[in-house]
């Protein structure tokens, strides 16, 4: 038969950050190719990445149609010379992925501090709202648009001259914190979805940004904007 020498895919794994979602699997193909299918629990199978020699398939376009649905994918293995007209009636070997619910399982991407501004003993720190590939009508939505108040940010801040960190939390993208006069501070933020109970509750920390660096001096009486 046409599928005798093909092996089923294995180690099917979802890799997803801010809803950019790729299914990966093994093995690297030798004389075989793969086709991926994806469906919701109640939907029909849709084929993607037809007869590919890759071991990954970008399924973002499918999952962003409804990020709160649960999806299942499967990977079919075909002989490398396979074309649809071969007439083989035997079902090719395939393997199912774990279920995947994007809203609950996509990883939070590393956030970025957009700006900070000091006025006297207050500093306003703003976190950049990341764009996702989720759409409403023809408009791309931001991370905040999708997660709303499910998403919070944690700010870690410390005096440049010491290592003792303080924290603040916000369910917006802004922090207003008290600082000591005449001291320079460093900042890092982390995105968090508190209602998650798994390892993907938190993003990695943002790059550290410090006051008083060459992009502009903070002035106790003035404003300091730090933009990427």
């Amino acid at each position: 038969s046409g599928t005798t020498n093909t092996v089923a895919a294995y180690n099917l794994t979802w890799k997803s950050t801010n809803f950019k979602t790729i299914l990966e699997w093994e093995p690297k193909p030798i004389n075989q190719v793969y086709t991926v299918q994806i469906s919701t629990k109640s939907g029909d199978w849709k084929s993607k990445c037809f007869y590919t020699a890759d071991t990954e398939c970008d399924l973002t376009d499918e999952i962003v149609k409804d990020v709160k649905q649960t999806y299942l994918a499967r990977v079919f293995s075909y002989p490398a010379g396979h074309v649809e007209s071969t007439g083989s009636t035997e079902e090719p070997p395939y393997e199912n992925s774990p279920e995947f619910t994007p809203y609950l399982e996509t990883n939070l991407g590393q956030p970025t501090i957009q700006s900070f501004e000091q006025v006297g003993t207050k500093v306003n720190v703003t976190v950049q709202d990341e764009w996702t590939l989720v759409r409403r009508n023809d408009t791309f939505l931001s991370l905040r648009d999708v997660f709303g108040k499910d998403l919070i940010y944690t700010l870690y801040y410390w005096k440049s001259s010491s290592s003792g960190k303080k924290t603040a939390k916000t369910n917006t993208n802004e922090f207003l914190i008290d600082v000591d006069k005449g001291e320079n501070y460093c900042f890092s933020v982390q995105a968090v979805i508190p209602s998650r109970r798994t390892a993907n509750r938190k993003s990695t920390d943002s790059p550290v940004e410090c006051m008083g660096h060459e992009k502009g001096e903070s002035r106790e009486t003035g404003h300091h904007h730090h933009h990427h």
Partner: antibody, heavy 120, light 113 residues
């Protein structure tokens, strides 16, 4: 079609407890917050709190902390509101509602309401 | 907690009228991250559950007639019904959907003149 179907009316004595159920269908139950809203006769709407069935994570309005408890059974797609030590002022219609698809986009679907009457 | 204040508390109008209901929040409902206002409007008829009309201050929920529109930003918001229909006589509520605890306005009862 998204539906939230609540349990029937209840008549309870002061000091008793009541458990209201809200059976969801037509959507992925675990990914949407279930909201609970109280409406006393002839009065406005009061948000009690919410629960995310996926994790059991809850938020409570301080006015209801202690006597109201939210729970969810994902195997039967049902959320529950339990109120203990009932008082006359707990007489109200209790609604469950489902959060919208987008972040902070309101309560898109509502149950029909459950009337709880507390009277001796 | 964010307080929501609606005005007027009640309002009499006729079919075909243009009606405006206002809602004021004690704190800004504008999200700095995405520049959206998390203010929601509902309609409720006697003996029925509320119905979502508008979210994000100005986005009409699917299936809601175009005569309903929402506007405003920060702390001041408006629900406008451009030409009242018989089925629009009901009570309208605004809601803070920005931060916990979520809070409703006291309601505006729209009655037939």
């Amino acid at each position: 079609e998204v539906q939230l179907v609540q349990s029937g009316s209840e008549l309870k004595k002061p000091g008793a407890s009541v458990k209201v159920s809200c059976k969801a269908s037509g959507y992925t139950f675990i990914t949407y917050w279930i909201e609970w809203v109280k409406q006393r006769p002839g009065q406005g709407l009061e948000w009690m709190g919410d629960i995310l069935p996926y994790s059991g994570s809850t938020n409570y309005n301080e006015n209801f902390k202690g006597r109201a408890t939210f729970s969810a059974d994902t195997s039967v797609s049902t959320a529950y509101l339990q109120i203990s030590s009932l008082k006359a002022e707990d007489t109200a219609v209790y609604y469950c509602a489902r959060s919208g698809y987008y972040g902070n986009s309101g309560f898109a679907y509502w149950g029909q309401g459950t009337l709880v009457t507390v009277s001796s | 907690d964010i307080q929501m204040t609606q005005s007027p508390s009640s309002l009499s109008a006729s079919v075909g009228d243009r009606v405006t209901i206002t809602c004021q929040s004690s704190q800004s409902l504008l999200s700095s991250g995405n520049q959206k206002n998390y203010l929601t409007w509902y309609q409720q008829k006697p003996g029925k559950a509320p119905k979502l009309l508008i979210y994000w201050a100005s986005t009409r929920e699917s299936g809601v007639p175009s005569r309903f529109s929402g506007s405003g930003s920060g702390t001041d918001f408006t629900l406008t019904i451009s030409s009242l229909q018989p089925e629009d006589f009901a009570t309208y509520y605004c809601q803070n959907d920005y931060t916990y605890p979520l809070t409703f306005g006291q309601g505006t009862k729209l009655e037939i003149k």
